[in-house]
Interface confidence: low
C-alpha cells in the first residue's frame, strides 16, 4: 500500500520534524504550510485550518519561502550616485549600485552603502590596475620610454614614438616630438582604453587594495583624513 | 543645514577604552538608521557597526564583536561606540553616518571623523 500523505496542518511523528516549505507552529503544535516568495501569512494555521497567505502589498517583498505576518519594506529610491539594477518586486527588493565611473568602497549585504569616484590618474601617470566594481583604481608613474599625456581613469602609459632625428626628447607625461616628417615608427596612435567595469550586481566583498596604493575616498567626505594618492586627482 | 559631529577619539593604549560621540542635527535623527565606519591608513573603509532608529536592533563587524558597544540616545540626537579592549588594529578616522531612509540604504549623511590612534 502506498504510504499516506499527510496533508496540513498535521501533527508531526515524535522527533520528526516538518517536510520542505511547511514549518512547525508552537501555539498549534501542528506541521503548516509556508507561504510562497511574494506573499506573506496573513492568518497563522491552527489545529484544524492551514496557514493563510495573502500577497505581499506594493513596495513590499519576501524573497524566500516564509510565515512572516507582514513583508518586508523596499529600500527607498537610489542615491544620486548610484543606479538601480534590481527593482522592488513582491519577491525581491530593489538594488542599488554604484553608476559608472564610481566604484563601491563600502558593502552592504545587497548592492552598495557607499560609491566613490574612481580616481584618475594625472598627466605622467597610467593605469596600472582598472578599477572594479569594488576596488578603484590604481595608477603607477609611467616608465622611462612611456608617457601619459591625459587625466584619466581608463589610460595607461604608452610608449614614445620613435623618432629619426628628436626635436623635444619624450618624458613622462609627454610624447617625443620628431624633427623629420614623419618618426621610423610610431607606437603611439592614441590613448590606449581599458574597459570600464560592467555594471551588474554588486559583489559582496569588502575592497581590499594594497595599503601603497590604496585609494583615499576621502574627497567624499566633509574632511577627510588623508589626500588622494600621489599620481591621482580627485576631479 | 545636517550636520554630524564626532568627538571622543584620541590616543589610548592597547588594551584601554574610548567612548566616542556623534551629536546629529538638521535631519530626523530619531527615524534614521545609524553607522559608524571607519578608515584605515591605508583609506580602506570598513563597516563597524550600526543601530535601528528605536536602538533594539544592533549590528558588529566580526572584527569588534564583544569589544564596541553602539547605543543612541534619541533624545539627545546623539549616538555613541564605547570601545573596549582596543588594539593597534582599531587605529583609524571613525565616521559616524546616517541613512534616513530615502536613499536606498546608502549612507547620505556623514561627520568629518574623529581619529583613534592606538598605540602598543
Known amino acids: 500500500l502506498p504510504a499516506q500523505v499527510a496533508f496540513t496542518p498535521y501533527a508531526p511523528e515524535p522527533g520528526s520534524t516538518c517536510r520542505l516549505r511547511e514549518y512547525y507552529d508552537q501555539t498549534a503544535q501542528m506541521c503548516c504550510s509556508k507561504c510562497s516568495p511574494g506573499q506573506h501569512a496573513k492568518v497563522f494555521c491552527t489545529k484544524t485550518s492551514d496557514t493563510v497567505c495573502d500577497s505581499c502589498e506594493d513596495s513590499t517583498y519576501t524573497q524566500l519561502w516564509n510565515w512572516v505576518p507582514e513583508c518586508l519594506s523596499c529600500g527607498s529610491r537610489c542615491s544620486s550616485d548610484q543606479v538601480e539594477t534590481q527593482a522592488c518586486t513582491r519577491e525581491q527588493n530593489r538594488i542599488c549600485t554604484c553608476r559608472p565611473g564610481w566604484y563601491c568602497a563600502l558593502s552592504k549585504q545587497e548592492g552598495c552603502r557607499l560609491c566613490a569616484p574612481l580616481r584618475k590618474c594625472r598627466p605622467g601617470f597610467g593605469v596600472a590596475r582598472p578599477g572594479t566594481e569594488t576596488s578603484d583604481v590604481v595608477c603607477k608613474p609611467c616608465a622611462p620610454g612611456t608617457f601619459s599625456n591625459t587625466t584619466s581613469s581608463t589610460d595607461i602609459c604608452r610608449p614614445h614614438q620613435i623618432c629619426n632625428v628628436v626635436a623635444i626628447p619624450g618624458n613622462a607625461s609627454m610624447d617625443a616630438v620628431c624633427t623629420s616628417t614623419s618618426p621610423t615608427r610610431s607606437m603611439a596612435p592614441g590613448a590606449v582604453h581599458l574597459p570600464q567595469p560592467v555594471s551588474t550586481r554588486s559583489q559582496h566583498t569588502q575592497p581590499t587594495p594594497e595599503p601603497s596604493t590604496a585609494p583615499s575616498t576621502s574627497f567624499l567626505l566633509p574632511m577627510g583624513p588623508s589626500p588622494p594618492a600621489e599620481g591621482s586627482t580627485g576631479d | 543645514d545636517v550636520q554630524l559631529v564626532e568627538s571622543g577619539g584620541g590616543l589610548v593604549q592597547s588594551g584601554g577604552s574610548l567612548r566616542l560621540s556623534c551629536a546629529a542635527s538638521?535631519?530626523?535623527?530619531?527615524?534614521?538608521?545609524m553607522t559608524w565606519v571607519r578608515q584605515t591608513s591605508g583609506s580602506v573603509f570598513e563597516w563597524v557597526s550600526d543601530?535601528?532608529?528605536?536602538?533594539?536592533?544592533?549590528r558588529y563587524a566580526d572584527s569588534v564583536k564583544g569589544r564596541f558597544i553602539i547605543s543612541r540616545d534619541n533624545a539627545k540626537s546623539t549616538l555613541y561606540l564605547q570601545m573596549d579592549s582596543l588594539k593597534t588594529d582599531d587605529t583609524a578616522v571613525y565616521y559616524c553616518?546616517?541613512?534616513?531612509?530615502?536613499?536606498?540604504?546608502?549612507?547620505?549623511?556623514w561627520g568629518k571623523g574623529t581619529l583613534v590612534t592606538v598605540s602598543s
Open positions: 553616518a546616517a541613512d534616513p531612509g530615502s536613499s536606498g540604504g546608502s549612507l547620505s549623511y
Open positions: 543601530i535601528n532608529p528605536d536602538g533594539q536592533n544592533t
Open positions: 538638521g535631519f530626523p535623527f530619531s527615524s534614521s538608521d
